[in-house]
Amino acid sequence: EPPTACREKQYLINSQCCSLCQPGQKLVSDCTEFTETECLPCSESEFLDTWNRETRCHQHKYCDPNLGLQVQQKGTSETDTICTCEEGLHCTSESCESCVPHRSCLPGFGVKQIATGVSDTICEPCPVGFFSNVSSAFEKCRPWTSCETKDLVVQQAGTNKTDVVCGPQDRQRA
């Protein structure tokens, strides 16, 4: 790391070290030999989240309902607004600039992890002994019916998309 001319939370200007503005404030004027750095608080709709020498604060993010966004956490002078997606939708990126509907798991697949505002549905193929016959964003793979416990026998084998079909046991005549 190269040497720096100033302390932490300072910056070099005109061969002298001036104090940076604290988070939530913007630079109005650099320090001089006789005056300190002049800083001003950001307005209500703006923020700066680091020690800085910015002359303009950043605008808070707008959570556009037309893009399926809603406010998860209101911004302050030191933090940006955090957006999340409305019910049934999730963010398309880490910065959550737009939303898309949750994916449904097709027949033969079940939900491994239900979607959140920031992550999509995770599906998994139904293993042997389980099935899913619906397209759903919530349903897990369900186990095949156990014919034996109902005193029935398997008449038709199950698949990953269908349950087994049970039927009565054949009675052998004497």
Partner: antibody
């Protein structure tokens, strides 16, 4: 009262490393930068760099870049200075020195040393 | 780096004398200058900071002046305990730099 107590004298061979410690007491260790200054026999004072004990941030003089490492352990309030690849011209007394706390420093780095360790003589000789 | 040039490198004086040491910076450093006194085998001792502010506990016979590039340390009436080496140090930007020192000796 403020005290900076350094580790004892060291004799090292060229190419070796030395680690000098500086134990602080009598003030909030994390509140003031700690600097290291050295003085070769019969010579003047030479600034080596600083560590901010609060953040662990460091700043080294260009001359020592890549050869010096300053660290700290806030639990036992102690600062350390390690110098690698020692040469005979590194023979010097090494001092730790605390920043003078200037509340009204409007510009400049305002690093004045109001308390010093007793010094650690490091002799580099084959 | 800012170079600090001290003069003279040594001065012979008697007890009671007025002694003046000068320090020149290679570029303007406003008032960000300190003066230290060092006795043999001891760590330096802060005398003056921000060019003219006397450090707590330092006798008032020591004074500092100057700003920009030219600075002065004055000992108004030299005392036996003042025979030592004096260093200036700029505190405007890193790297901090010291003058080469001025040794005040007994005449």
């Amino acid at each position: 009262q403020v005290q900076l107590v350094q580790s004892g004298a060291e004799v090292k061979k060229p190419g070796a490393s030395v680690k000098v410690s500086c134990k602080a007491s009598g003030y909030t260790f994390t509140g003031k930068y700690m600097h290291w200054v050295r003085q070769a026999p019969g010579q003047g004072l030479e600034w080596m760099g600083w560590i901010n004990p609060d953040s662990g941030g460091t700043n080294y003089a260009q001359k020592f870049q890549g050869r010096v490492t300053m660290t700290r352990d806030t639990s036992i309030p102690t600062a350390y200075m390690e110098l690698n690849r020692l040469r005979s011209d590194d023979t010097a007394v090494y001092y730790c020195a605390r920043d003078q706390p200037l509340g009204y420093c409007t510009n400049g780095v305002c690093s004045y040393f109001d308390y010093w360790g007793q010094g650690t003589l490091v002799t580099v000789s084959s | 780096d800012i170079q600090m040039t001290q003069s003279p490198s040594s001065v012979s004086a008697s007890v009671g004398d007025r002694v003046t040491i000068t320090c020149r910076a290679s570029q303007g450093i406003y008032s960000w200058l300190a003066w230290y006194q060092q006795k043999p085998g001891k760590a330096p001792n802060l005398l003056i900071y921000t060019a003219s502010t006397l450090q707590s506990g330092v006798p008032s016979r020591f004074s500092g002046s100057g700003s920009g590039t030219d600075f002065t340390l004055t000992i108004s009436s030299l005392q036996p305990e003042d025979f030592a080496t004096y260093y200036c140090q700029q505190a405007n930007i890193f790297p901090l730099t010291f003058g080469g020192g001025t040794k005040v000796e007994i005449k």
